[in-house]
Interface confidence: low
């Protein structure tokens, strides 16, 4: 069953997805698609990474985390009701049928006419599972690759908190672990 996330029309939606590269810069291809994960690949691809960088993206869809460290969470900018639906995050681990597939359900709510100034956006559910590997995770990023790491437009406050605070690590650590190799 899908994990559910919510956002309001006009806001940014955040769909978390993580894995841990086996070594710094040793990236696993990832695709994001609109629709449930099919047997292979992603349907209706909106963003794709390869072994070195983001190599395909479409307007309004960005990676807001450090994808070189395995944070391949998707931000959808300025959502509309049409963005509602299932999204597939597929970690394309080498080998036959090794891919990890996460189906995330995005529910878009109409914007409130007069939102309370202190109200935070309503995101629900825990993070999806996190892939990890034996041994040590990647070292702190300095410059791991020959390309800029990230594209980001107006990321939501909550997404910033998730990425920047200890809460993010706590949530990641609480996820089910899958070991590769």
């Amino acid at each position: 069953s899908e994990v559910e996330y919510r956002a309001e029309v006009g806001q940014n939606a955040y769909l978390p997805c993580f894995y841990t590269p086996a070594a710094p810069g040793n990236l696993v291809p990832v695709c994001w698609g609109k629709g449930a994960c099919p047997v292979f690949e992603c349907g209706n691809v909106v963003l794709r990474t390869d072994e070195r960088d983001v190599n395909y993206w479409t307007s309004r869809y960005w990676l807001n985390g450090d994808f070189r460290k395995g944070d391949v969470s998707l931000t959808i900018e300025n959502v509309t009701l049409a963005d509602s639906g299932i999204y597939c995050c597929r970690i394309q681990i080498p080998g036959i049928m090794n891919d990890e597939k996460f189906n995330l359900k995005l529910v878009i709510k109409p914007a409130k006419v007069t939102p309370a100034p202190t109200r935070q956006r309503d995101f629900t559910a825990a993070f999806p599972r996190m892939l990890t590997t034996r041994g040590h995770g990647p070292a702190e990023t300095q410059t791991l690759g020959s390309l800029p790491d990230i594209n980001l437009t107006q990321i939501s406050t909550l997404a910033n908190e998730l990425r920047d605070s200890r809460l993010a690590n706590d949530l990641r650590d609480s996820g089910a672990t899958i070991r590769i190799g």
């Epitope: 993206w57 702190e140 300095q142 800029p148």
Partner: antibody
């Protein structure tokens, strides 16, 4: 909305130092590299280098190693380009640009004139 | 370094004409990392086409891009006066990131 606002024009003498600022707003500063590009009068665009806004680590094109230095003031969401020991041939307009998958947002440019 | 050579350096067209400018790389560029920028006189460059053929929002649909390997092109299907500008190709495939010398499009 995303904006990169650069400091104003500079008139300098050879041998002096100039520091150009680039104030970013409308996005989370440390999630996108900041690139710098030079445009000399009557010439094309030339990539100077970029700085990783999380680690502060810069990378320079070969032609700009030495006298050109990129730095950050992360708390102020501001990137800097400093050129020391200015030469007449540094006369140009310098642009900061958010270096993401492509250079999608640009500052308005800072004109630097070096003349004795 | 990967040298990008644009041609022609200057081109002139009448409104309604179709124009094509090219960008040739000295070594292979992944189509994902070949971009085009538009710069009008006295203004900052703007990302005009990304990843060979994708148009950012706000760029008119009369612009298109194509190519692969070492040869890329930008086409305007029906030139308008507002298209007068210099267009630069740029590659992100490896250091240093390089720009072509630019093609200046003049409108008659």
């Amino acid at each position: 909305q995303i904006q990169l606002v650069q400091s104003g024009p500079e008139l300098k003498k050879p041998g002096e130092t100039v520091r150009i600022s680039c104030k970013a707003s409308g996005y989370t500063f440390r999630t996108a590299e900041m690139q710098w590009v030079q445009k000399m009068p009557g010439r094309g665009l030339k990539w100077i280098g970029w700085i990783n806004t999380r680690s502060g680590v810069p990378k320079y094109a070969e032609d700009f190693k030495g006298r050109f230095a990129l730095s950050l003031e992360t708390s102020a969401t501001t990137a800097y380009l400093q050129i020391s020991n200015l030469k007449n041939e540094d006369t140009a307009t310098y642009f900061c640009t958010r270096g993401t998958y492509a250079m999608d947002y640009w500052g308005q440019g800072t004109s630097v004139t070096v003349s004795s | 370094e990967n040298v990008l050579t644009q041609s022609p350096a200057i081109m002139s067209a009448s409104p309604g004409e179709k124009v094509t400018m090219t960008c040739r790389a000295s070594s292979i560029v992944s189509s994902s990392y070949l971009h085009w920028y538009q710069q009008k006189s006295g203004a900052s460059p703007k990302l005009w086409i990304y990843s060979t053929s994708n148009l950012p929002s706000g760029v008119p649909a009369r612009f298109s891009g194509s190519g692969s390997g070492t040869f890329y092109s930008l086409t305007v299907s029906s030139v308008e006066s507002e298209d007068a500008a210099t267009y630069y190709c740029q590659q992100y495939s490896g250091y240093p990131y390089t720009f072509g010398g630019g093609t200046k499009l003049e409108i008659k």
